[in-house]
């Protein structure tokens, strides 16, 4: 025997009180899947969060967060404090990254400067609070008569996937 | 009959974290959302955030959104509520109850005899 | 989010007396439920959507009002209705809670 209330269409919700009939979502919730008995309430951008996306009868409201501020978590579910290049978040607020460490973003936390002689090579550009250091090529490749020096690769901005 | 069967009482430490059951029997699990309510002692009513067992969807009120979680589990008819980072301010009894979302008038028809969470050092 | 101010906080009343509590929203909403609640118990479903009584409730509460002013009212009052009764509201996110009023009989 089908259940009557599968045949109820996302945005409306199959009204136990009411012989089981689609009732449209009331305002301020929202149903995204058929056949469903209650309406959910939609969720609510306020304060450090705005609103992306409106809620619709068929779909949730989206947030993202106020200049300042960035998302964390599935569906920008918290968000945390912007810092400038070369700080990082702690319970204190914003502090500069420790000597010998970088962060070249305006999340996340300090990281060590890569340390250039694990690979056998030397410091080309020393680092500082907002960048990493930059390898050149080991001291042995400077001895006269060693090839020309090719530049290195750029190093990819974490956190961002290629497009 | 329809009833809501909460957790013993706890009593934790400062930063510590407390989960809590609410056990339904009686009715369609599945057809109800369950509410989380929060009652300081000598205090009113504090909402802080629902599930809907069906579909797992959680809505919570913004002031609990990163220290309360709630899940529920279909194949015992039971939500739970986690609440971590615990202060003293959170010494409550804690409520779960029921509401009929197809009402769609969102009113807590039956409640749970409450938990009640001491956090002290 | 919408706060509900009930008055008054608590009332002393003799049986037999009509006792009406009020609840005022500081911005318009649809309906309003009620929620009655004794010591060391769980709050109980009083009336919903602002004048329907709950299974059990006796005839003698009744419940009405629209847009930010609604009132519970216990025609002749009964020494049983000693209690703290709750308005609350969802017509906007979150739920919220009125303060609570203590009814007591003398």
């Known amino acids: 025997l089908q259940d009557p209330c599968s045949n109820c269409p996302a945005g409306t919700f199959c009204d136990n009180n009411r012989n089981q009939i689609c009732s449209p979502c009331p305002p301020n919730s929202f149903s995204s899947a058929g056949g469903q008995r209650t309406c959910d309430i939609c969720r609510q951008c306020k304060g450090v969060f705005r609103t992306r996306k409106e809620c619709s009868s068929t779909s949730n409201a989206e947030c993202d967060c106020t200049p300042g501020f960035h998302c964390l978590g599935a569906g920008c579910s918290m968000c945390e404090q912007d810092c400038k290049q070369g700080q990082e978040l702690t319970k204190k607020g914003c502090k500069d990254c420790c000597f010998g460490t970088f962060n070249d973003q305006k999340r996340g936390i300090c990281r060590p400067w890569t340390n250039c002689s694990l690979d056998g090579k030397s410091v080309l550009v020393n680092g500082t609070k907002e960048r990493d250091v930059v390898c050149g090529p080991s001291p042995a490749d400077l001895s006269p008569g060693a090839s020309s020096v090719t530049p290195p690769a750029p190093a990819r901005e974490p956190g961002h996937s290629p497009q | 009959q329809v009833q809501l069967v909460q957790s013993g009482a706890e009593v934790k430490k400062p930063g510590a974290s407390v989960k809590m059951s609410c056990k339904a029997s009686?009715?369609?699990?599945?057809?109800?959302?369950m509410h989380w309510l929060k009652q300081a002692p000598g205090q009113g009513l504090e909402w802080i955030g629902y599930i809907n067992p069906s579909s797992g969807y959680t809505n919570y009120n913004q002031k609990f959104t990163d220290r309360a979680t709630l899940t529920a589990d279909k194949s015992t008819s039971t939500a739970y509520m986690e609440l971590s980072s615990l202060r003293s301010e959170d010494t409550a009894v804690y409520y779960c109850?029921?509401?009929?979302?197809?009402?769609?008038?969102?009113?807590?028809?039956?409640w749970g005899q409450g938990t009640t969470v001491t956090v002290s050092s | 989010e919408i706060v509900l101010t009930q008055s008054p906080d608590f009332q002393s009343a003799t049986p037999k007396e009509k006792v009406t509590i009020t609840c005022r929203a500081s911005?318009?909403?649809?309906?309003i439920h009620w929620y009655q609640q004794k010591p060391g118990s769980s709050p109980k479903a009083w009336i919903s959507a602002t004048s329907n009584l709950a299974s059990g409730v006796p005839s003698r509460f009744s419940g009405s009002g629209s847009g930010t002013s609604y009132t519970l009212t216990i025609n002749r009052v009964e020494a049983e209705d000693a209690a703290t009764y709750y308005c609350?509201?969802?017509?906007?996110?979150?739920?919220?809670f009125g303060q609570g009023t203590k009814l007591e009989i003398k």
């Open positions: 109850a029921r509401s009929d979302g197809s009402s769609s008038k969102w009113y807590f028809d039956v």
């Open positions: 609350q509201q969802w017509s906007s996110n979150p739920f919220t």
């Open positions: 009686g009715y369609t699990f599945t057809f109800y959302t």
């Open positions: 911005s318009s909403v649809s309906y």
